[in-house]
Every structure is written in C-alpha cells, then in structure tokens.
C-alpha cells in the first residue's frame, strides 16, 4: 500500500510568492512559492495519486506583514483552502501568546493541530482542551494513518507560551502516544513535528513504532540528486535512520518559506512496516502556475496590508541615525534602537535566578539601510521601517562561546574605515577598540551584561563561557564574513521577522528617543 506525503514546514507567512531568496517578490517571472502555486501542485498530485496526505510541520506564524496584520487568521484561512490534513505546532505559533494561537488558528482550523509534548495546566487546561491533540488517526483510502505531533521543548525560550503550558521531552512524550495508537491497531504512524533535524533523527531512532518522521524548525534541505536551486542539501531525501529496534525510518524536511513542497512516497506492508521510501522536495518555481482562485483570494486579503503600511506605529522625538556614515563607523542610535528592540522581544523570565535568558545583541551596521527623520511629526510607519530593514530577515537566538564573540568583534573592525558592513552595533555589550593595533588584536575591552543576576551589570567576557546572543539570521549564517559565528555556533533558533520586532517595540514604547551612550568606544 502506497502513501504519498506532501509536506511543508517553516513557511513563516510567505503566503504570496517570493524571490528565490524568500524575500519580497520583485520580478514575478522568477518568483517562487506562495499558497496559490502550492495549491496548483498539491491538486495536481491529488488528482494523479490515490492516497495523499498534506502535512505542515509548524511555524506557519511570523515572518511577513501578513502575520503582523492578520495575526494567524490568514494561516487558518489559506491552510483550510488548501485542505491540509494536519499541522504540528511550532514555537512561533506562540508568538502572540496562547490567546493568539487559540482564537485565530486553533478555533478556525478545519484540520487537526497536533503536539504530544505540550501539556496544559491550570485554568488553560479546560479552555484549550480538544483544540489541539497529541495525535490524530486519519482515514486514507481503505487504511488509517496515525499522525503524532511534537514541538520544540525550547519554546518557552523562543516564544510566549505563558506559564500554563508545559513543554515535555519529545521522546518521553511521544512513546506512550505511539503505544496507544498501536493498541488501537493503527500500524502506520507518522511523527510530525517542530524540533529540528537532530531531534527528528533521534525520534526516528528512539520512538518504537514511528514509521516516518516529518520535521521542521531547522530549515533543513534534503535532496537526492542535483539540487534545483541555491540550497545545499544536508543529506539525501529521505534521510534514513536505523532505529534501535532495527528498522529503516525515513526522515524528511522541506527547507522553509514555502519554496519547496516535500514529496515522499512510502510503501507499507500489511503490518505497517515501511518497505520502501523515495521522493524529493519539489521546487515551486514559476513553471508551476498560481491557482487563479487562491490568487484572487490573496489579492483580496492584500488590500488591508497596503493600508497598514502607512499607519503610525509610534513616534520618535530624535533623529534615528541609520546612515552608513554613522552605523558602519561608530555607535549609531538606530543600531541601539534595533538592538534594544531585539532584547525586548526576547524577554522571557523562565528562571528566578536569571533576570532574563539573554542580554546581548549584535547587529551588522551594513544591515541598517536608512535613517528616519523625526521632522515628519515624529511619525514612524511600517513603510519607514521597511526602508531601514528591507531584507526580510529574522532576529535569531544563538549560543556562542566567549571566544567566538571575541573573534566576531575583531572581525567587526579588521578593515575599519572602508565603510564596510561588518561593523557591529550592539546591545548589552560594552566594547572598546584600539584601532592603532593590528587587525585581529584591536579589541582591548569586551564587557557583557550579566543574565544570572538580579541587578544587571557589565562583567568581562569569559572565553570559555557559553553566551546567548540575539542577532540577524544573516550573521548566524556567516554573512558579512562572520564565518566564525556560522562555524562555531552551538545552537541556532530562528526568531521573529526583523521589522516586526522593531515595530512591536515602537508601538509598545509609543515615544522613543534612543541615544548614543558609549556602548562602542
């Protein structure tokens, strides 16, 4: 019996088609993805093949103005329209708190939303009961398939799930649910979830009875053969894991941003064992037409976005200096504003010993593309912020050793004076450079804000200590020559859309007046 699994993950509100790098579509003839194009391909496969499931492995939320404005209603609407069969909860589904998940998505979705390792307690338990499930048994043809969900247990550090949701260890939580499915005579079981490729592989290895793992969170691109676009495969598709009980378990993920549709064909025997698995992600490029009815719906929903872009978010009473003449040479107040917003967006008081789990921010000066003049009545709009941060990136959470941070700050000024983009703006860091010294030895003082303290203060950076840092995804991926970050990072979790982070901060503060205050000397 053959099952076709179509899967997406980490779509991050790319409802409209995008450019090849998943930023705003400029030249339509070369654009990719989007729900209208996705629907065309899904329908084509549904017509051609008998047993098809369309699954999403989480993080539909967060990433473009679509989410900022519609707050998840757009996810429910278009996933319903595409007739998704199931979705796993990702960490970003909690970005607007539990209410921001329940009302727009959980209550509106016509498909099951799954996570076996999230347990509700207190007053939330009854409120959320039945709105998400640990597993769901889906009829497919004359067979049944069990889908069991999981979500990164790091979610309390990455999003805003509140205090009434407990995130358990994935493997510990999954095993009893899979066992339950087995007692219900469900012998074909897919683990669908959002914990990253390493955890996906562990689930395949450790959870008895899981036949296939469909994952997300790490934006992993897998491919067999010659890849069709710029993404470099992390392994073959599917990636085969030998389980502890001697089975071959296929593990898949489909990169991110709706650029690809994962396509996996699985052959099951009478006992639900996987006899064979093969497939590849399908690049959703312009050779696949956008479905006209979905496209028309997208255009209808778009109208509200255009109006939102020009509305006032808050005011500034000072000039926001985002000029390259400032931000690529010295501390600039636009850099300070953005870093302050990045830290504010990551306030998570999850431990009494820590005032926060992260206190540091770094930001490449070259990523700041425009100033904002306060002489327009001080008004700041989304449109203004899009000029400052035009690349559609995210502000991510990484873990780095002190020694890596030291290398990063040396790189920041290794060719100082040439107006290059690698000059770092900071938050929660005091750095002193001596530019008379030779490149690679110019950082003379590097103090960082403590986290395990009730009164935050600056202490010297320790080379062997592991620090959490908020930074643009561009830097986490080694951009602007920061290869040491990419090579040496110990953990990397994708964060919120850059403009959204700053816009939320400005809306919260109402009036802003960031200063140049001696962070960089």
């Amino acid at each position: 019996w053959e099952l076709t699994i179509l899967h997406t993950n980490d779509v991050h509100s790319r409802l409209e088609q995008t450019s090849e790098d998943s930023s705003k579509c400029v030249n339509a003839s070369r654009c990719m993805g989007g729900v209208a194009r996705l629907f065309t391909k899904v329908q084509q496969i549904r017509r051609a093949e008998p047993n098809v499931l369309l699954l999403d492995a989480g993080d539909q939320y967060q990433g473009t103005i679509w989410f900022t404005v519609y707050k998840g209603a757009e996810v429910a609407h278009f996933m319903n329209a595409l007739r998704y069969d199931a979705m796993a909860l990702g960490n970003h589904e909690f970005d607007n708190g539990v209410e921001g998940l329940i009302e727009p998505l959980l209550k509106e979705a016509k498909f099951p939303i799954l996570s076996a390792n999230i347990k509700a307690k207190g007053p939330l338990a009854s409120q959320i009961s039945g709105l998400y499930l640990p597993y769901k048994v889906l009829p497919v043809g004359d067979e049944v398939v069990g889908i069991v969900g999981y979500t990164s247990k790091e979610t309390p550090f990455l999003s805003n799930p509140g205090t009434n949701l407990v995130f358990e260890d994935e493997i510990t939580a999954l095993q009893p649910e899979v066992d339950k499915l087995k007692t219900l005579n469900v012998n074909k079981i897919i683990a669908l979830g959002h914990s990253g490729f390493e955890m996906d592989k562990l689930i395949a290895q450790k959870v008895r009875g899981v036949d296939v793992v469909v994952g997300g969170h790490s934006n992993t691109f897998l491919y067999t053969g010659n890849p069709p676009s710029k993404e470099v495969p992390a392994g073959k598709y599917p990636f085969i894991v030998t389980s502890d009980d001697g089975r071959k378990v296929p593990v898949v993920q489909a990169y991110a941003f709706g650029k690809y549709l994962g396509y996996l064909k699985i052959e099951f025997d009478e006992r639900g064992n996987v006899i064979s698995s093969h497939g590849n992600p399908i690049l959703l490029n312009s050779s696949i037409p956008e479905d006209p009815s979905i496209k028309a719906d997208i255009n209808k929903w778009r109208i509200k976005l255009d109006n939102y872009s020009t509305q006032e978010l808050g005011k500034t009473i000072v000039y926001l200096d985002g000029s390259s003449q400032s931000c690529r040479f010295r501390e600039c107040n636009m850099g300070n504003l953005i870093c302050d917003a990045m830290i504010n967006n990551n306030l998570r008081h999850t431990d009494e010993m820590f005032w926060n789990h992260v206190s540091m921010c770094i930001l490449n000066g070259g990523g700041i593309r425009s100033p904002i003049d306060e002489r327009n009545n001080g008004t700041i709009t989304w449109e203004n912020l899009a000029a400052v941060l035009p690349f559609g990136g995210t502000f991510d959470l990484v873990q780095l050793k002190g020694s890596t941070l030291k290398k990063a700050f040396e790189h920041s000024v290794h060719r100082y004076g040439q107006s290059t983009g690698e000059f770092l703006q900071v938050g929660g860091i005091h750095v002193v450079y001596d530019l008379s010294r030779k490149p690679g030895d110019r950082v003379v003082k590097l103090d960082v804000l403590c986290t395990k303290c009730r009164v935050p203060s600056y202490d010297p950076l320790k080379m062997d200590e592991v620090y959490k840092v908020i930074l643009p995804n561009f830097l986490a991926n080694g951009g602007d020559g920061f290869q040491m970050i990419k090579d040496e990072l110990l953990r990397h979790d994708s964060g919120d859309q850059d403009i959204n982070v700053v816009s939320t901060y400005i809306s919260k503060m109402k009036v802003i007046y960031p200063a140049v205050e001696g962070r960089i000397k």
């Epitope: 043809g141 004359d142 071959k248 025997d269 009478e270 006992r271 064992n273 064979s276």
Partner: antibody
Framework: EVTLKESGPVLVKPTETLTLTCTVS????????IQWIRQPPGKLLEWLAV???????DYNAAFISRLTISKDTSKSQVVLTMTNMDPVDTATYYC???????WGQGTLVTVSS | DIQMTQSPSSLSASVGDRVTITCRAS??????LNWLQQKPGGAIKRLIY???SLDSGVPKRFSGSGSGTEYTLTISSLQPEDFATYYC????????FGGGTKVEIK
C-alpha cells in the same frame, strides 16, 4: 492483529479440482494483495499466484492453465482453485501477504486415490 | 523470471557461532528481499524485510545486508532456537525463493 488462515480439503483425488480459501484479518484486501505458495514434503517453497489489491492476478507460468485466483473483499477472503490435481501436487499450501510479512500456518493437501 | 541462488544449502554449527547465509539474484532486485525462517513444524516467519530491516520481535542477533544482486543474512551468535531452515525471497518481480539453508546442530 494481522492474521491469515488457509482452509480447504486435506485429501483430493487425482484429476479433481482443489479449492483453497485464505481468510484475512487485520488488513483490507482493497489495500493489499495475497500470494499463494506451496511446499511439497521435504522440498522447496514454490510460488503459485498473487491477486493484487486492485483485483488483477499473476500466475506462475508453469501452472497458468490450472490456476484461478479470486477474492471477495467484503468477506476478506481469497480463493485459489487448481484443476486436474495429481499426486505430485501433494504439498503444504500457504497463503501470505503481498510483502510476506504475514503467513498462514499452511494446510497439507494430499492427492491420492 | 528472477532466479535466486542461495548458499550453502546446509551447514552445521554450534551455539554461539556466527553464521552467514548468502543469496545471489539473477538481476538487480533493488533491496526488495526478505529472509524467512521455517521451523520443523512448517510454520514460516519473516525475519528481515527490505534487505536489512528487522521484523518486530526478531532478536537483534539477526541482521541483513546487501544491494543489487548480492544479499546476506547473518546470525551473530547462534542460539538453540535458531536451528531451522532459512530462505531468501525476492519480491521485485513475481516471487521467487532461494533453495533454502538448513542450519543444523554440529
């Protein structure tokens, strides 16, 4: 639980037709095929026929004129008939799932006058 | 038809021995190979499917490997209950079996 069970006569006379039934539980014949295999005493396993989930059938070329396989999906039963039986057809007859994950316990059929 | 050549046809071994049985297909069968165990009573049980995946409840001393036309069943440490006849079965085309290997007590 996935099980298969063969049933039919234990003794048939030469030239007669053998009719064997395989009753399936735990999976659907609309999703999976059924294979028939036999093993003469002290000899090797020999594949006879398969009926696929869609209803089409394939036969061992050596027996194609003598074999017919059919199924009743609603009853979860597959029937194999073998005409013109001969003493050399004495064997244990097994039905098995399409992929061999499950086998019946086998039924010994003796061809003798 | 695809022919399956299994060797040896029989072997004598002691408890604790490592036993290897091989099957050669007349053409590439693309990992579509099972290993079956038949006890003297006649009951047939699949041990390994798709070349190397272990069936539920089968001890880990059994392992399968191979690709293309060459396939191997290994019993890492023979136990008393393992004395039986073993068959390879290809399902890339119409089923064909190897000639069987009878594993006897030395």
């Amino acid at each position: 639980e996935v099980t298969l069970k063969e049933s039919g006569p234990v003794l048939v006379k030469p030239t007669e037709t053998l009719t064997l039934t395989c009753t399936v539980s735990g999976f659907s014949l609309s999703s999976y095929g059924i294979q028939w295999i036999r093993q003469p005493p002290g000899k090797l396993l020999e594949w006879l026929a398969v009926i696929w989930s869609g209803g089409s059938a394939d036969y061992n070329a050596a027996f194609i004129s003598r074999l017919t396989i059919s199924k009743d999906t609603s009853k979860s039963q597959v029937v194999l008939t073998m005409t013109n039986m001969d003493p050399v057809d004495t064997a244990t007859y097994y039905c098995a799932g399409q992929y061999g994950s499950v086998w019946g316990q086998g039924t010994l059929v003796t061809v003798s006058s | 038809d695809i022919q399956m050549t299994q060797s040896p046809s029989s072997l004598s071994a002691s408890v604790g021995d490592r036993v290897t049985i091989t099957c050669r297909a007349s053409q590439d069968i693309g990992d579509r190979l099972n290993w079956l165990q038949q006890k003297p009573g006649g009951a047939i049980k699949r041990l390994i499917y798709a070349t190397s995946s272990l069936d539920s409840g089968v001890p880990k001393r059994f392992s399968g490997s191979g690709s293309g036309t060459e396939y191997t069943l290994t019993i890492s440490s023979l136990q008393p209950e393992d004395f039986a006849t073993y068959y390879c079965l290809q399902y890339a085309g119409s089923w064909t079996f190897g000639g069987g290997t009878k594993v006897e007590i030395k």
